[in-house]
């Protein structure tokens, strides 16, 4: 055992020594603006090697439909950039708000600016004097004062201004030792909100040319968040260049420039007024459908599914799968380039869903005596790091004309009750159709959406009496015609779960 452990350690050291030397970035301290031109960045080379090995191993053995090894049999992840052709320019003293859904590449963008993630293409220009506030607040053992000053020379006026702007005065006044109260080991425990404010204060206290604030308000209540955004980000730091990762519409309104990321690409770049001028595209893409609130909960889920899969369901005539969609969110201004394919062509975009069993586990706050029938439904829980552990996920969902093998198998299992025997799914007959209207329809569920997608190709009418063999024939796989796509998050989740 010791021998194997030693070998493992030696291999790790060897791998480390063989890596490329870390290149310290060259900065120009006279630079006043922050510029990113056509920046594309990939995950480090180790991931690519791992995929090559996995694919080789997989080619050496035959895979069946349900085999776990199928995971590596059909994908195109080797060249998946975490950021694709990103452009922006902000002048000294401006605020750039970076928005986007989970996994869009917001933090990766900051990592590229800091030099933690090396771009494969493009240019980045800034002075190099950076202060960073992580979305995960951290505290070092020591006093509150030490945690904020953090080795920087002490300036009483600056320190007091930061304490006030970050709403820490009231918290500090509660302690007899004031800001000399010890935190961490042997000291007091702070709330998530207090830790977040101290982390922000630390970043703001440091003198820098560029402040990178990665979702600093995540653990703050809406009133505190609003006050700190105004007093700290907008007033105290008014003459500083700031890049704020945020999802709040209120913050976007106050920003000089807005960059919205989606799956690593630039979905929109410009000012808030330019964003508003994109009506009605603005409301349809960012806000969904206006008449949404008159629909039942189940209908909403159906519309959600439809919104996320805007392809040939929207017309009766068959649509070419390579057809380019309407260009609505073009980058405006200086970098007015065409949007990336993943945005233009939703077919190639990957959507991650959670199909979770509705149990008290996922429903914080539901009374135990709730007698609602069990049902499968689309989980709308955001894909957050903290919440991921309790949310079992379907690895891949492909929006191509032919569903991926895994997706088909899960739908097959769902329809034939093989996943949950005790579940009684009453379904209405769904005829083959291409058009999903937005008019309210009774009891339309995700199953109906799946059924439509299946029947779209086969013309098969699925009724309550399902012949399993007939159904299996509809799920026949022509592996070569299946577009092989997944996401980095899926891959990383897989590696995390299956690492030895």
């Amino acid at each position: 055992q010791t021998w194997y452990d030693s070998l493992g350690a030696i291999n790790k050291i060897q791998d480390f020594l063989q890596k490329q030397e870390y290149k310290t970035l060259e900065y120009n301290l006279t630079t006043t603006e922050v510029v990113m031109e056509n920046v594309t960045a990939f995950w480090e080379e180790g991931f690519g090697e791992l995929f090559e090995k996995a694919k080789q191993n997989n080619n050496n053995r035959k895979t069946s439909n349900g085999d776990d090894s199928l995971f590596f049999s059909n994908f195109s992840l080797l060249g998946t950039p975490v950021l694709k052709d990103i452009n922006f320019k902000i002048e000294r003293g401006q605020l750039l708000a970076v928005a986007g859904s989970t996994g869009a590449g917001k933090t990766s963008l900051l990592m590229v600016i800091m030099g933690e993630l090396e771009p494969s293409e493009g240019k980045i220009k800034h002075s190099g004097r950076i202060s960073f506030c992580s979305q995960f607040s951290w505290i070092m053992p020591g006093t509150i004062k030490e945690n904020i000053i953090f080795g920087v020379s002490y300036d009483e006026y600056r320190y007091r201004s930061v304490i006030k702007a970050c709403q820490l005065e009231e918290d500090i006044s509660k302690f007899a030792e004031k800001d000399n109260i010890v935190l961490g080991e042997g000291g007091i425990t702070l709330s998530g909100g207090q830790r977040a404010r101290i982390s922000l204060a630390r970043a703001v206290y440091k003198d820098a040319d560029l402040y990178l604030l990665d979702s600093p308000f995540g653990y703050l209540d809406v009133l505190t968040e609003k006050e700190i955004f105004e007093s700290c980000v907008c007033k105290l730091m008014a003459n500083k260049t700031r890049i704020l990762v945020t999802s709040k519409m209120e913050h976007l309104k106050k920003a000089d420039k807005i960059l919205i990321l989606h799956e690593g690409s630039s979905y929109f770049y410009g000012t808030f007024s330019e964003l508003q001028n994109l009506q009605p595209d603005f409301s349809s893409k960012l806000m969904g459908c206006d008449s949404f609130d008159q629909f039942s909960a189940e209908r909403r889920n159906s519309i959600l599914t439809e919104t996320l899969h805007r392809f040939s369901l929207e017309g009766d005539a068959p649509v070419s799968w390579t057809e380019t969609k309407k260009q609505s969110f073009k980058q405006t201004g200086e970098f007015g380039e065409k949007r990336k394919n993943s945005i233009l062509n939703p077919i190639n975009s990957i959507r991650k869903f959670s199909i979770v069993q509705k149990t008290p586990l996922q429903m914080n706050g539901i009374e135990e005596d709730s007698d609602e029938p069990l049902e499968r439904r689309l989980s709308l829980v955001p894909d957050s790091e903290q919440g991921e552990a309790i949310l079992p996920r379907i690895s891949v969902i492909s929006t191509g004309p032919t569903l991926q093998a895994r997706r088909r198998q899960s739908v097959l299992n769902l329809m034939t009750h093989s996943v949950n025997q005790g579940q009684n799914i009453h379904r209405k007959t769904t005829a083959s159709t291409r058009k999903v209207s937005l008019a309210p329809q009774a009891n339309l569920t995700e199953l109906d959406i799946y059924s439509r997608r299946l029947s779209q190709e086969t013309g098969l009418e699925i009724s309550e009496e399902i012949n399993e063999e007939d159904l299996k024939e509809c799920f026949f796989d022509d592996m070569e015609s299946i577009p092989a796509v997944t996401t980095w998050n899926t891959y990383l989740r897989y590696i995390t779960v299956h690492k030895s």
Partner: nanobody, 121 residues
């Protein structure tokens, strides 16, 4: 657009309990932070409790140990269980939800109309 509707407020004696609920309806893709805030006459609105999308909770010092916040993501609802109520808990209780309307992830703040909670001594 989303709409928030609070319920569960009312008159209760000191030491009693209440359970507030707030349901969001309308165009909802997902909801991030949810919270309860209160405003007593002549005072500013203040935090009671809030819960993140990951289920992490935060409470005002004055209600710790007495109030419990929880959420039902499937029903877009946030609850506030209040026990050992005190006369100083008397206020209008407002619900807040940070609603995301579409897949791009932009977040909009919505507030309920408020529900009166009166604790008599």
């Amino acid at each position: 657009v989303a709409y928030l509707q609070e319920s569960g407020g009312g008159l209760v004696q000191a030491g009693g309990s209440l359970r507030l609920a707030c349901v969001a309806s309308g165009n909802i893709f997902t909801i991030n932070n949810m919270g309860w805030y209160r405003q007593a006459p002549g005072k500013q609105r203040e935090l009671v409790a809030f819960i993140t999308s990951a289920g992490i909770t935060n409470y005002a010092d004055s209600v710790k140990g007495r109030f419990t916040i929880s959420r039902d993501n499937a029903k877009n609802t946030v609850f506030l269980r209040m026990i050992s109520l005190k006369p100083e808990d008397t206020a209008v209780y407002y619900c807040h939800q940070a609603v995301v309307h579409g897949p791009i992830g932009l977040e909009y703040d919505y507030w309920g109309q408020g529900t009166q909670v009166t604790v008599s001594s």
